[in-house]
Amino acid sequence: MAVTACQGLGFVVSLIGIAGIIAATCMDQWSTQDLYNNPVTAVFNYQGLWRSCVRESSGFTECRGYFTLLGLPAMLQAVRALMIVGIVLGAIGLLVSIFALKCIRIGSMEDSAKANMTLTSGIMFIVSGLCAIAGVSVFANMLVTNFWMSTANMYTGMGGMVQTVQTRYTFGAALFVGWVAGGLTLIGGVMMCIACRGLAPEETNYKAVSYHASGHSVAYKPGGFKASTGFGSNTKNKKIYDGGARTEDEVQSYPSKHDYV
């Protein structure tokens, strides 16, 4: 039961995390105008990975996409790449983990295969989360650098005659969404990896023989000793060709007449 719970929770946490990464990537508020001495501004600027926007106090908002690819800063391109890689890996991870879930039965998929898929999706979630965290952190670092540079140049006008106030940008909501989402995806991935350990049959260097206490039938089960007690019920009336990989969270019941090989 604990393994299924861990796997399920890992999946849900990762799903929320990846949804958050997608949301953060699409959001326009990666950087917002710093209202350092003016909490209410008549013109408010904010920027995303794909476009920049201006919101006026009239209520009018205008957004313009970055229609150039070569003219954009390399750092912005890198952040875009990291976020997209994170989304792609996360999406593949979600797809893999759906089939890996213990509560979902697909044909006669072995538990060892499910364990491998759980591990694969877990690793994908971890990498996805790290990509998102890295992308957001790179952008945040870029903002901090530009912030202090613009602060240094804040009131450098032509001979001090005309004030040219430079617009400074600070952390936008998307950065926090990205950090949290990346963290959740990472945690979800770790949970999937932990669940994989519970799913995986422990390899031994001998063949386990399972004895049924109920009668004459003897089930020979190659595989891990963990599942070799032979007391698990096979209520679905299907033959036990699963290599003996049983887990503690499968329903345990007394042997019945359906226990056969």
């Epitope: 008549a42 201006v54 006026e56 106090s57 009239s58 009018f60 005309v162 040219t164 617009t167």
Partner: antibody
């Protein structure tokens, strides 16, 4: 079509109070009060976001004037306290539009502060 | 606060003349986010409310005749009436629309010569 109709102006003694109203019809995201003293130029008084109620004032009016709105009546208000002789002016309510320009103005209401 | 200085304070002109009014701001009104200058021009006739002519320094408000045009960037702006018409005799104001508090120029009165 946007329509703005001011009311509430009149004669008031120095130190007195007055509340101006502006009946609004049509789409208004943000509204303002702008005044014009006799024979003088235009002076912006206050701004309000009609959805959030967030206000902003010119420094000369902070603490004395309060801009507010009543959604149910679709009315904009300017509560003026501690009035001085120099507050004598025609008060306009005006809608802010794209580019932060005032496109629709009321007909104006005259406020005279005199003893 | 941003100070707005208009010149001249008044001018006399004849119908058909080309008229130019300048407005200078104490700070740049150019917004880096959209590269637009937040300067607005108004026309006011005696006893009437002002009328919006131009916003974003050069964008003509709908219904305003094309003889009116605006230009400029940063701190220096110009309103031009290419061919003055009888109905154009009025007072013209520029406005800082970039930051609170919104501030107006002192006005330029265009009179008949």
């Amino acid at each position: 079509e946007v329509q703005l109709v001011e009311s509430g102006g009149g004669l008031v003694q120095p130190g007195g109070s007055l509340r101006l109203s502006c009946a609004v019809s049509g789409y208004t995201f943000s509204m303002n009060w702008v005044r014009q003293a006799p024979g003088k130029g235009l002076e912006w008084v206050a701004w309000i976001n009609m959805y959030t109620g967030e206000p902003t004032y010119a420094d000369d009016f902070k603490g004395r004037f309060t801009i507010s709105r009543d959604d149910s009546k679709n009315t904009l208000y300017l509560q003026m306290n501690s009035l001085r002789a120099e507050d004598t002016a025609v008060y306009y309510c005006a809608r802010l539009v794209r580019g932060n320009g005032f496109d629709y103005w009321g007909q104006g209401t005259l406020v005279t502060v005199s003893s | 606060d941003i100070q707005m200085t208009q010149s001249p304070s008044s001018l006399s002109a004849s119908v058909g003349d080309r008229v130019t009014i300048t407005c200078k701001s104490s700070q740049s009104l150019l917004n880096s986010g959209n590269q637009k200058s937040y300067l607005t021009w108004y026309q006011q006739k005696p006893g009437k409310a002002p009328k919006l002519l131009i916003y974003w320094a050069s964008t003509l408000e709908s219904g305003v005749p094309s003889r009116f045009s605006g230009s400029g960037s940063g701190t220096d702006y110009t309103l031009t009436i290419s061919s003055l018409q009888p109905e154009d005799f009025a007072t013209y104001y520029c406005q800082n629309a970039y930051s609170f508090p919104f501030t107006f120029g002192q006005g330029t009165k265009v009179e008949i010569k």
